[in-house]
Interface confidence: medium
């Protein structure tokens, strides 16, 4: 049984309808909580703005792959 209604619950109720340039993205996190209406990806941009995106869209998947590779590649 969850102990809090709201604390640490973040949901996406709608998705952006614009593709965001991968150069503008800093990180992402997946939203899979059963408290939320749909699975989602929250991208954080380089100016720290968070935007909801649909994980089923190809550009979202590609962006996540790109960010994953960025974090795996050691910076020289």
């Amino acid at each position: 049984q969850p102990d809090a209604i709201n604390a640490a619950v973040t949901c996406c109720y709608n998705f952006t309808n614009r593709k965001i340039s991968v150069q503008r993205l800093a990180s992402y996190r997946r939203i899979t909580s059963s408290k939320c209406p749909k699975e989602a990806v929250i991208f954080k941009t380089i100016v720290a703005k968070e935007i909801c995106a649909d994980p089923k869209q190809k550009w979202v998947q590609d962006s996540m792959d790109h960010l994953d590779k960025q974090t795996q590649t050691p910076k020289t």
């Epitope: 604390a7 949901c11 909801c52």
Partner: antibody, heavy 128, light 110 residues
Framework: QSLEESGGDLVKPGASLTLTCKAS?????????MCWVRQAPGKGLEWIAC????????TYYASWAKGRFTISKTSSTTVTLQMTSLTAADTATYFC?????????????????????WGPGTLVTVSS | AYDMTQTPASVSEPVGGTVTIKCQAS??????LSWYQQKPGQPPKLLIY???TLASGVPSRFKGSGSGTEYTVTISGVQSDDAATYYC????????????FGGGTEVVVK
């Protein structure tokens, strides 16, 4: 569009009581809660508990209410509050309220709830 | 534990004046704050949610503001119909919470 509480009564200390909240014409979407709030005579509002009106039926309690109060969703339009070991301090009007979630687009939002619909209340008096 | 402290406990203002009610949370509640109006013998009525958004049908003379731990509701051009008790409520967390409501502020309109 209404909520109506029933079951309030005059009971003796130590007794148990079950209150019922019946909804009419209220939309219980997956992202709303049914809650109980009480108010002792001449005092402020005191949140007791909420139950998720969606499929999960998850329950949430004020720290003081855990163990002695039990909220349950008994049907798609009915919620109950079971109260045990009642004392004079439990004397109050008990309100049923819908907690609704608000959000913004397309930015992430925490589940922000406010009680947007209330019943008229039912009076519980605990006295010997 | 997200305790809500409301001030003042009571305020008296003539018709047309301005009433300001403050609500302080013991920890940041990130704008997860609502305000309610309650008249004697009636259930509370939602006025403001998400700290500053007016609920449907609420007159524009009510204004909510604040952030972090400090929040305010202001009634400008107060009317006799505004005489009531006002409560704030945090909805940031229900974990280990004793009460999500503030203690209330009685508004008397002279």
């Amino acid at each position: 569009q209404s909520l109506e509480e029933s079951g309030g009564d005059l009971v003796k200390p130590g007794a148990s009581l079950t209150l019922t909240c019946k909804a009419s014409g209220i939309d219980f979407s997956l992202y709303s809660y049914m809650c109980w709030v009480r108010q002792a005579p001449g005092k402020g509002l005191e949140w007791i508990a909420c139950v998720d009106a969606g499929a999960s039926g998850s329950t949430y309690y004020a720290s003081w209410a855990k163990g002695r109060f039990t909220i349950s969703k008994t049907s798609s339009t009915t919620v109950t509050l079971q109260m045990t070991s009642l004392t004079a301090a439990d004397t109050a009007t008990y309100f049923c309220a819908r907690g609704i979630l608000y959000y913004t687009w397309p930015y992430p939002a925490g589940a922000i709830d406010a009680f947007d619909s209330w019943g008229p209340g039912t009076l519980v008096t605990v006295s010997s | 534990a997200y305790d809500m402290t409301q001030t003042p406990a009571s305020v008296s203002e003539p018709v047309g004046g301005t009433v300001t009610i403050k609500c302080q949370a013991s920890e940041s509640i990130s704008n997860y704050l609502s305000w309610y109006q309650q008249k004697p013998g009636q259930p509370p009525k939602l006025l403001i949610y998400k700290a500053s958004t007016l609920a449907s049908g609420v007159p524009s003379r009510f204004k909510g503001s604040g952030s972090g731990t400090e929040y305010t509701v202001t009634i400008s051009g107060v009317q006799s119909d505004d005489a009531a008790t006002y409560y704030c409520q945090q909805s940031y967390s229900s974990s280990n919470v004793f009460n999500t409501f503030g203690g209330g502020t009685e508004v008397v309109v002279k």
